[in-house]
């Protein structure tokens, strides 16, 4: 029950996180005009990853896309890439985790397969969250650097922009959304990985009872389950006829490195 709750909660938290990462990536307020200690203007500038906007009087807003790839700073391109990678990994992770949910039955899917998928989606969420956090942090660092350099525009050189009024930019709402969303995705991923442990069938403590017959030595192993993440063999309850040769179940009696997160 606790495993199902952990997995379900991990999925929901990751879902919220990925929705947040998508929202942050699409938002225009990555950097906003710094109003503190600046001449007060009747227009308000703010910029996103894809376009820059100017809000004039009476809420009249005009946005212009960055219709160039080569003219944009490498850092901005890197941030875009990190956010997109984060979204893609997160989306795949969500897809995988839906099928991995314990509360959803799909055919005769084994618990071991579900554990494997849960771990995979968990790792994907962790990487997705890290990508988002990294992307937002790189952008924030770029802002801080430019702020102290007092550049007139963050994307100087883009479209032959002239440095005129000292418009300084500070952290926009998208950065905070991105950080929180990345953190949630990361937490959700960790929860999925924790849930994976509980989902995986564990090795029982029963000793194998041997019955000696005249011709053959037949060992009956009542609970031969072991934790599997898909990297090992797909084991089931098996009757083991031990005629000198040992089955796969007996070969690996110690937990593998994939059994625990």
């Amino acid at each position: 029950m606790a495993v199902t709750a952990c997995q379900g909660l991990g999925f929901v938290v990751s879902l919220i996180g990925i929705a947040g990462i998508i929202a942050a990536t699409c938002m225009d307020q990555w950097s906003t005009q710094d109003l503190y200690n600046n001449p007060v203007t009747a227009v308000f500038n703010y910029q996103g990853l894809w376009r820059s906007c100017v809000r004039e009087s009476s809420g009249f807003t005009e946005c212009r896309g960055y219709f160039t790839l080569l003219g944009l700073p490498a850092m901005l391109q890197a941030v875009r890439a990190l956010m997109i990678v984060g979204i893609v990994l997160g989306a795949i992770g969500l897809l995988v985790s839906i099928f991995a949910l314990k509360c959803i039955r799909i055919g005769s899917m084994e618990d071991s397969a579900k554990a494997n998928m849960t771990l995979t989606s968990g790792i994907m969420f962790i990487v997705s969250g890290l990508c988002a956090i990294a992307g937002v942090s790189v952008f924030a660092n770029m802002l801080v650097t430019n702020f102290w350099m007092s550049t007139a525009n963050m994307y100087t050189g883009m479209g032959g922009m002239v440095q005129t009024v000292q418009t300084r930019y500070t952290f926009g709402a998208a950065l905070f959304v991105g950080w929180v969303a990345g953190g949630l995705t990361l937490i959700g991923g960790v929860m999925m990985c924790i849930a994976c442990r509980g989902l995986a069938p564990e090795e029982t403590n029963y000793k194998a009872v041997s019955y000696h017959a005249s011709g053959h030595s037949v060992a009956y192993k009542p609970g031969g389950f072991k934790a599997s993440t898909g990297f090992g063999s797909n084991t089931k309850n098996k009757k083991i006829y031990d005629g000198g040769a040992r089955t796969e179940d007996e070969v690996q009696s110690y937990p593998s490195k994939h059994d625990y997160v």
Partner: antibody, heavy 119, light 113 residues
Framework: QVQLKESGGGLVQPGGSMKLSCAAS????????MNWVRQSPEKGLEWVAE??????????HYVESVTGRFTISRDDSKSSVYLQMNRLRAEDTGIYYC??????????WGQGTTLTVSS | DIVETQSPSSLTVTAGEKVTMSCKSS????????????LTWYQQKPGHPPKLLIY???TRESGVPDRFTGSGSGTDFTLTVTSVQAEDLAVYYC?????????FGTGTKLELK
């Protein structure tokens, strides 16, 4: 069509108070940034005050010479903007225009109301 | 505070003549965010409120005849009337619509010979 009509002007003694009103129609008043601009032979056209819309928290701005004496306010339910003027001086004399600031331009102006500060 | 200086203070012209008036701002009115100049031109006839002519330094307001042209960038701006008509006789004001206070220029009076 857009209309702005000022009222409340008149003769007032120095140090006195006066409240100007501007009734607007023909546009979504609650979205607009509203301004007061005055004109006198001595100073020409002079921007006095601005009040922004609800989305901009009804933020206000004033010219330095009236800061602390004049207060701009609005009532979106009545589509009206007001200018409360206290501690009036002779140099406040002039025609007061109510204007709408849209897209960084004063696109509509009222006919104006005259304020005379004299003893 | 930003100061808008207009020159000349008055212009005496004949009908059909081309006229140019200048407006200089003490600080650049060019916004780096959209590369737009926040300077506006108004026309005021006696006994009337000012009327919007040109905004964003060069964009003509709808209904304004195309003989009125605004140009310039940064701190130096110009209003040109290509062929002056009798109805164009008025005072022309430029205004900074970027920095507070949103100051107006001193005005240029257009008179007929």
């Amino acid at each position: 069509q857009v209309q702005l009509k000022e009222s409340g002007g008149g003769l007032v003694q120095p140090g006195g108070s006066m409240k100007l009103s501007c009734a607007a129609s023909g546009f979504t008043f609650s979205d607009a940034w509203m301004n007061w601009v005055r004109q006198s032979p001595e100073k020409g056209l002079e921007w006095v005050a601005e009040i922004r819309n609800k989305a901009d928290y009804h933020a206000t701005h004033y010219v330095e010479s009236v800061t602390g004496r004049f207060t701009i306010s609005r009532d979106d339910s009545k589509s009206s903007v007001y200018l409360q003027m206290n501690r009036l001086r002779a140099e406040d004399t002039g025609i007061y225009y109510c204007t709408r600031n849209y897209g960084s331009r004063f696109d509509y102006w009222g006919q104006g109301t005259t304020l005379t500060v004299s003893s | 505070d930003i100061v808008e200086t207009q020159s000349p203070s008055s212009l005496t012209v004949t009908a059909g003549e081309k006229v140019t008036m200048s407006c200089k701002s003490s600080q650049s009115l060019l916004n780096s965010g959209n590369q737009r100049n926040y300077l506006t031109w108004y026309q005021q006839k006696p006994g009337h409120p000012p009327k919007l002519l040109i905004y964003w330094a060069s964009t003509r307001e709808s209904g304004v005849p195309d003989r009125f042209t605004g140009s310039g960038s940064g701190t130096d701006f110009t209003l040109t009337v290509t062929s002056v008509q009798a109805e164009d006789l008025a005072v022309y004001y430029c205004q900074n619509d970027y920095f507070y206070p949103l100051a107006f220029g001193t005005g240029t009076k257009l008179e007929l010979k």
